[in-house]
């Protein structure tokens, strides 16, 4: 018997693009440009469950819905990996798994999803409003991250069975509809851009969470839902964070873990920490007031109980180091 995270109502970002654009008439073209650029974006889903049998036990499941080859998965809590989050587990497709207390068991559940059982008491015990994040590094799509959490009101004693999350799929009508809109939009966009070519190009501020300057993408609503794929990363009760996460539990102790930073659990650095070559930037976000706004992908964002979908606010980064090339 489990209690699932309930995903809050997803809202599109409030600040319009007009402030950044300067011209109201250019809003539509840039939204259309986003539609042209972002079709086919991969998605990451996250499900957080509290086990009723063990009140301090959580099961986090994450999966990747993309067409790339997964090269690394990082699970963290307390926020996105590399943005204040604390690494709980790192799963390499072939070289094994490393986890830190209070992670009890991390494993590949399918070829494109992982699960992590978390338990503990006291300082290292997760609490109901903790945010858990999963980051998938894939080739050639880059890195994508999503976060999810259990609401504080979750009652582990509830006897109701877990509500199955909706299936993420694009039916034929959706595909044709989106294709038509994109085709029309791109043509119309070119027309409008030619009309407005004498105007200065808008300046889009890159996110300050990333050292790179990402290519701009605005948020684009899906035809299947008025809800965006985005919820700002939740602030968490810091008392739920572990005091220390020094204990490592590698599965079989593969040699590739030797290159793991000593305090990666405290300062998660993500896959880039082990890459032997610089990682090129490939951005995916527009930052307005340093907000983290996700773009909607091709699939309808049918999020359901326990599922949260949105990509990495720092944009995809291709793995080029020893962990990325097989």
């Amino acid at each position: 018997m489990r209690t699932e995270a309930q995903v809050p109502a997803l809202q599109p970002p409030e600040p319009g693009l007009e402030g950044a654009m300067g011209h109201r008439t250019l809003v539509l073209p840039w939204v259309l440009l986003t539609l042209c650029v972002t079709a086919g974006t991969p998605e990451v889903w996250v499900q957080v469950r509290m086990e009723a049998t063990e009140l301090s036990s959580f099961t986090i499941r994450c999966g990747f819905l993309g067409s790339g080859s997964i090269s690394l998965v990082t699970v963290s809590w307390g926020g996105p990996n590399g943005a204040g989050g604390t690494t709980l587990a790192v799963l390499h497709p072939e070289r094994g798994i490393r986890q830190w207390a209070p992670a009890r068991q991390a494993r590949w559940e399918t070829q494109s999803s992982i699960s992590l059982i978390l338990e503990g008491s006291g300082a290292s015990s997760p609490c109901a409003n903790t945010t858990f994040c999963c980051k998938f590094a894939s080739f050639p799509e880059g890195s994508w991250e999503a976060c999810g959490s259990l609401p504080p009101s979750s009652d582990p004693g509830l006897s109701a069975p877990p509500t199955p999350a909706p299936i993420l799929r694009a039916d034929l009508a959706g595909i044709l509809g989106v294709s038509g809109v994109l085709l029309f939009g791109c043509v119309y966009l070119l027309h409008l851009l030619r009309r407005h070519k004498h105007r200065p190009a808008p300046r889009l501020q890159p996110s300050r969470t990333s050292p790179q300057a990402p290519r701009a993408r605005a948020w684009a609503p899906s035809q299947a839902s008025q809800a965006a794929l985005h919820v700002p990363y939740a602030t968490i009760n810091t008392s739920c964070r572990p005091a220390t996460l020094d204990t490592a539990h590698p599965h079989g102790g593969p040699s590739w873990w030797a290159s793991l930073p000593t305090h990666a659990a405290h300062r998660p650095q993500g896959p880039a920490a082990w890459a032997s070559t610089p990682i090129p930037a490939r951005g995916s976000f527009v930052s307005v007031e340093n907000g983290l706004y996700a773009q909607a992908g091709e699939r309808p964002p049918h999020t359901g109980p326990g599922l949260t979908l949105f990509p990495d606010p720092r944009g995809p980064r291709a793995m080029e180091g020893p962990l990325g090339v097989r």
Epitope: R61, S69, E94, G96, E109, T110, P162
Partner: antibody, heavy 123, light 106 residues
């Protein structure tokens, strides 16, 4: 040892839909993905898609996107594959199979398999 | 989508022969490759997973090798029960099967 038992043969008219079931017994159903594979007479194997029952999220092969719907019912340990807008070339044996792996790597394979369900599409 | 090309599509061999079937992926799939055996009217049966790991209960005369894009299934000494169709399958990005290789009695 997990066993997968599929529903019986079906005869359908072109344009209609078919829903094939796959019931698991003797092992964990929820967290392992269930895949659907079809095989037309005298032809090779085609992966259609899969679902992780505990999450309810399905992946589909591009060829079948929009025409296939894979669902699962955790309470009965049963997965379903529904194929719509049937045509004669959809005549095939449809198999369900469990995505199996060791857990510590990303290697997965299909084992065990259901016995197969023959779907005949004919006017 | 990753395409898997098997060769030959069929072959004739005798009991005791050494048989080699190859499978080529359209892009690198590391060692994410499985081999299945299928007999008429039956569901496929897993032989080899992760390119070279023998499934439990499968005779040791079956072996798999390769990584990246080129893979091989070898039957060291063909037995009467080995006459069947063999399929490779990539499991790196979703799943795709090869076209199959039918092993017939010469």
């Amino acid at each position: 040892q997990v066993q997968l038992v599929q529903s019986g043969a079906e005869v359908k008219k072109p344009g209609s839909s078919v829903k094939v079931s796959c019931k698991a017994s003797g092992g964990t159903f929820s967290s392992a993905a269930i895949s659907w594979v079809r095989q037309a007479p005298g032809q090779g194997l085609e992966w259609m898609g899969n679902i992780i029952p505990i999450v309810g999220i399905a992946n589909y092969a591009q060829k079948f996107q929009g025409r296939v719907t894979i669902t699962a019912d955790e309470s009965t340990s049963t997965a379903y594959m529904e194929l719509s807008s049937l045509r004669s070339e959809d005549t095939a044996v449809y198999y369900c199979a469990r995505d199996t792996g060791r857990g510590y790597t990303r290697h997965f394979w299909f084992d065990p398999w259901g016995q197969g369900t023959l779907v005949t599409v004919s006017s | 989508d990753i395409q898997m090309t098997q060769s030959p599509s069929s072959l004739s061999a005798s009991v005791g022969d050494r048989v080699t079937i190859t499978c080529r992926a359209s892009q690198s799939i590391s060692s994410y490759l499985n081999w299945y055996q299928q007999k008429p009217g039956k569901a496929p049966k897993l032989l080899i997973y992760a390119a070279s790991s023998l499934q439990s209960g499968v005779p040791s005369r079956f072996s798999g090798s390769g990584s990246g894009t080129d893979f091989t299934l070898t039957i060291s000494s063909l037995q009467p029960e080995d006459f069947a169709t063999y399929y490779c399958q990539q499991s790196d990005i979703l799943y795709t099967f090869g076209g199959g290789t039918k092993v017939e009695i010469k």
